[in-house]
Amino acid sequence: MMTGTIETTGNISAKKGGSVILQCHLSSTMAQVTQVNWEQHDHSLLAIRNAELGWHIYPAFKDRVAPGPGLGLTLQSLTMNDTGEYFCTYHTYPDGTYRGRIFLEVLESSVAEHSARFQIP
């Protein structure tokens, strides 16, 4: 029985050229997290974080993606094309797979507010 919930930073906005932290957090379960996958809106792979083997950053993003903090991901040098959905997939034992969603809006405006509240989708 899967008892856990994924909390994410929800809908966030950040300005073009800036950076943003994509963060998910698994709670309400004692399951062991074996791997976290990060995917972009077109379901292409951004990064994998295996509990023991560390990080795999997809080459197309290696200059713009920094691992962490924690199991999260920092996306840098944002472009308008970065707008869209991001998914964190937690592979756990024995529960199975949990998935969280974040929507990132990249704004041209220099007054873009970067909200980083956690919410349960």
């Epitope: 996958n37 023991e52 083997l53 795999h56 290696k62 691992p67 592979h91």
Partner: antibody, heavy 119, light 107 residues
């Protein structure tokens, strides 16, 4: 340049154990995860497991849990794999190989160590 | 575990020919796939990583493509020194797994 130099061939009796070494040079061992791969004669490759030299954390293929133990000695930049309770099925070439920095592909390989289990 | 299937154990080709080797994953591995070359009596060598990226120093006649479950490794113009076994390898999830290998034979 990066080099992974493995210990020599081993001829061991059934039921015995063997410890293979992989001496690294040309890079800092703690920067890359080290993996071990088995290749039985004329067969494909099997991933045994990997070890993060930073913290000693290991990830094993379930098939090799209890068979293989991976360790690293940071002071000598050497990775080790111990195989126990050997049978003829364990006769194979064993490779140490490292994964790329922030990638999981295996970019440098040792020359392989042949383990022969025979009475 | 994710099974990696290379449908051709052997492929015969001539120098100068174009040859493609396929690899099929039993489930989606995104682009977390590498290709290795193993020449007789040698250790495997990394050729392609993340499905389509050529590793440093690898000649541009070697290319990789695909994502999800279907992947292709192509040699645009086979050279005599390409005689080897080629393996695909998924690292999307542990245990990492390899294909059975495709032995390229030169006519």
């Amino acid at each position: 340049q990066v080099q992974l130099k493995q210990s020599g061939p081993e001829l061991v009796k059934p039921g015995a154990s063997v410890k293979i070494s992989c001496k690294t040079s040309g890079y800092t061992i703690t920067e890359n995860t080290m993996h071990w791969v088995k290749q039985s004669h004329g067969k494909s490759l099997e991933w045994i497991g990997g070890i993060n030299p930073n913290n000693g954390g290991t990830s094993y293929n379930q098939q090799f849990k209890g068979k293989a133990t991976l360790t690293v000695d940071k002071s000598s930049s050497t990775a080790y794999m111990e195989l126990r309770s050997l049978t003829s099925e364990d006769s194979a070439v064993y490779y140490c190989t490292r994964s790329s920095y922030y990638r999981y592909d295996l970019d440098y390989w040792g020359q392989g160590t042949t383990v022969t289990v025979s009475s | 575990d994710i099974q990696m299937t290379q449908s051709h154990k052997f492929m015969s080709t001539s120098v100068g020919d174009r040859v493609s080797i396929t690899c099929k994953a039993s489930q989606d591995v995104k682009t977390a796939l590498a290709w290795y070359q193993q020449k007789p009596g040698q250790s495997p060598k990394l050729l392609i990583y993340s499905a389509s990226y050529r590793y440093t120093g690898v000649p541009d006649r070697f290319t990789g493509s695909g994502s999800g479950t279907d992947f292709t490794f192509t040699i645009s113009s086979v050279q005599a020194e390409d005689l080897a076994v080629y393996y695909c390898h998924q690292h999307y999830t542990t245990p990492w797994t390899f294909g059975g290998g495709t032995k390229l034979e030169i006519k």
